[in-house]
């Protein structure tokens, strides 16, 4: 995929901005105590265009499509209580803790890579 | 999908937008005499925004992506002069002439409806 | 002098796909000379067109169909082919792949003899 | 419902001229070349006219296309018996961004 698009000639006051936000995220199961934590969120506007196409394409489809999204984010165990449960009385979730966000190729699945 | 966002509540000084620019495109063919002809092109920034994921899912993955592209495009045929091609003196293309952009769903297929 | 020749089941049961294939003898289709189609005929009705494909791969398809046509081409076999998905009773009709008068849309200079298909269970 | 509109039927004596007409619009006819094509009963489409007036090599000049406007018309003189078919015109449509045919004629030929 092509590199992310910060800038455009043609609109040289725009650009592209792509935040990780905190947030308190409430992290629940079934029959058990749900826990807030802090964690970060990706909201942003990244650049998009799309140049005409033709039959038969004379070259690739001129198509760009940038998403904000997680640029590094590692999952970690959130231990939830769940009292009157004897069989499970502790449940273990995966949280995806967000690091970074950064304007992304639109098709690409999120980095979870970790620190 | 859900519908485009046009504006976050956490920042209410921003705005999705997505223009159709007026562009000349050259249109070719190999041994044929090209033509310019006069075009828009959709170019933009739509929001996008990535909630952190659990495993397992509480809820759906809190992911929403917007791209723009054409809401709505007519394909034409363009005519180019071949000469000195006897087997293919003319040859025709198809051209997506665009008329309208908006913020989208990334990967919804652009529409090609007619006016 | 080219010919077309269709094949393909002749009944599909209606939500399957119907897979159907173009063989083009007589002449090459990675010439790059001409667009290739498919097109069809409801019983005792006129004529819809469904697809083009060049020899590159590159096709247009019928906004009315895009979301259920696809059509490739395998050019060291000299074929294209039509896949439509999720088929009712409305897609029974007599399929024709034909061939575009040199690279022009629209003037289709050569047919196949069409293959009947019946969408039923 | 076709986009491009024929008489349903049309019959003429053998020996005699006929004409068959196909109306569109500015987003079809009025803009992009029409074709025009016989088909014999049981039996493929076969291209008689292109580009408006052209005749592929092989087809007699019995057969002659024309258009004005947004109309477009097919004529046949010397009628004959093997003339009898069903005639399709055929464009390309801007605005339905796709290749369009009219309903159909067909020729008897009396």
């Known amino acids: 995929a092509p590199p992310p698009i910060n800038k455009l000639a043609l609109f040289p006051d725009k650009s592209a901005w792509c935040e990780a936000k905190n947030i308190t995220q409430i992290v629940g199961h079934s029959g058990c105590e749900a826990k807030s934590i802090q964690n970060r969120a990706c909201l942003g506007q990244c650049f998009s265009y799309s140049v005409p196409n033709t039959f038969p394409q004379s070259t690739e489809s001129l198509v760009h499509c940038d998403s904000c999204m997680p640029a590094q984010s590692m999952w970690e165990i959130v231990t939830l209580e769940c009292p009157g449960h004897e069989e499970v009385p502790r449940v273990d979730k995966l949280v995806e803790k967000i690091v970074h966000c950064s304007c992304q190729a639109c098709g690409k699945e999120p980095s979870h890579e970790g620190l | 999908a859900p519908p485009p966002i046009n504006k976050l509540a956490l920042f209410p000084d921003k705005s999705a937008w997505c223009e159709a620019k007026n562009i000349t495109q050259i249109v070719g063919h190999s041994g044929c005499e090209a033509k310019s002809i006069q075009n828009r092109a959709c170019l933009g920034q739509c929001f996008s925004y990535s909630v952190p994921n659990t495993f397992p899912q509480s809820t759906e993955s809190l992911v929403h992506c917007d791209s723009c592209m054409p809401a709505q495009s007519m394909w034409e045929i363009v005519t180019l002069e071949c000469p000195g091609h006897e087997e293919v003196p003319r040859v025709d293309k198809l051209v997506e002439k665009i008329v309208h952009c908006s913020c989208q769903a990334c990967g919804k297929e652009p529409s090609h409806e007619g006016l | 002098q080219v010919q077309l020749q269709e094949s393909g089941p002749g009944l599909v049961k209606p939500s399957q796909t119907l897979s159907l294939t173009c063989t083009v003898s007589?002449?090459?289709?990675?010439?790059?000379?001409?667009?290739w189609s498919w097109i069809r005929q409801h019983p005792g009705k006129g004529l819809e067109w469904i697809g083009y494909?060049?020899?590159?791969?590159?096709?247009y398809y019928n906004p009315s169909l895009k979301s259920r046509v696809t059509i490739s081409v395998d050019t060291s076999k000299n074929q294209f082919s039509l896949k439509l998905s999720s088929v009712t009773a409305a897609d029974t009709a007599v399929y024709y792949c034909?061939?575009?008068?040199?690279?022009?849309?629209?003037?289709?200079?050569?047919w196949g003899q069409g293959t009947m298909v019946t969408v039923s269970s | 419902q076709s986009v491009l509109t024929q008489p349903p039927s049309v019959s003429a004596a053998p020996g005699q001229k006929v004409t068959i007409s196909c109306s569109g619009s500015s987003s079809n006819i009025g803009n992009n070349y029409v074709s025009w094509y016989q088909q014999l009963p049981g039996t493929a489409p076969k291209l008689l006219i292109y580009d408006n007036n052209k005749r592929p090599s092989g087809i007699p000049d019995r057969f002659s296309g024309s258009k004005s406007g947004t109309s477009a018309t097919l004529g046949i003189t010397r009628l004959q018996t093997g003339d009898e078919a069903d005639y399709y015109c055929?464009?390309?449509?801007?605005?339905?961004?796709?290749?369009?045919f009219g309903g159909g004629t067909k020729l008897t030929v009396l």
């Open positions: 007589g002449g090459s289709i990675s010439s790059g000379g001409y667009y």
């Open positions: 055929g464009t390309w449509d801007s605005s339905l961004s796709a290749g369009v």
């Open positions: 034909a061939r575009d008068a040199p690279l022009r849309i629209g003037a289709f200079d050569i």
């Open positions: 494909i060049y020899y590159s791969g590159s096709t």
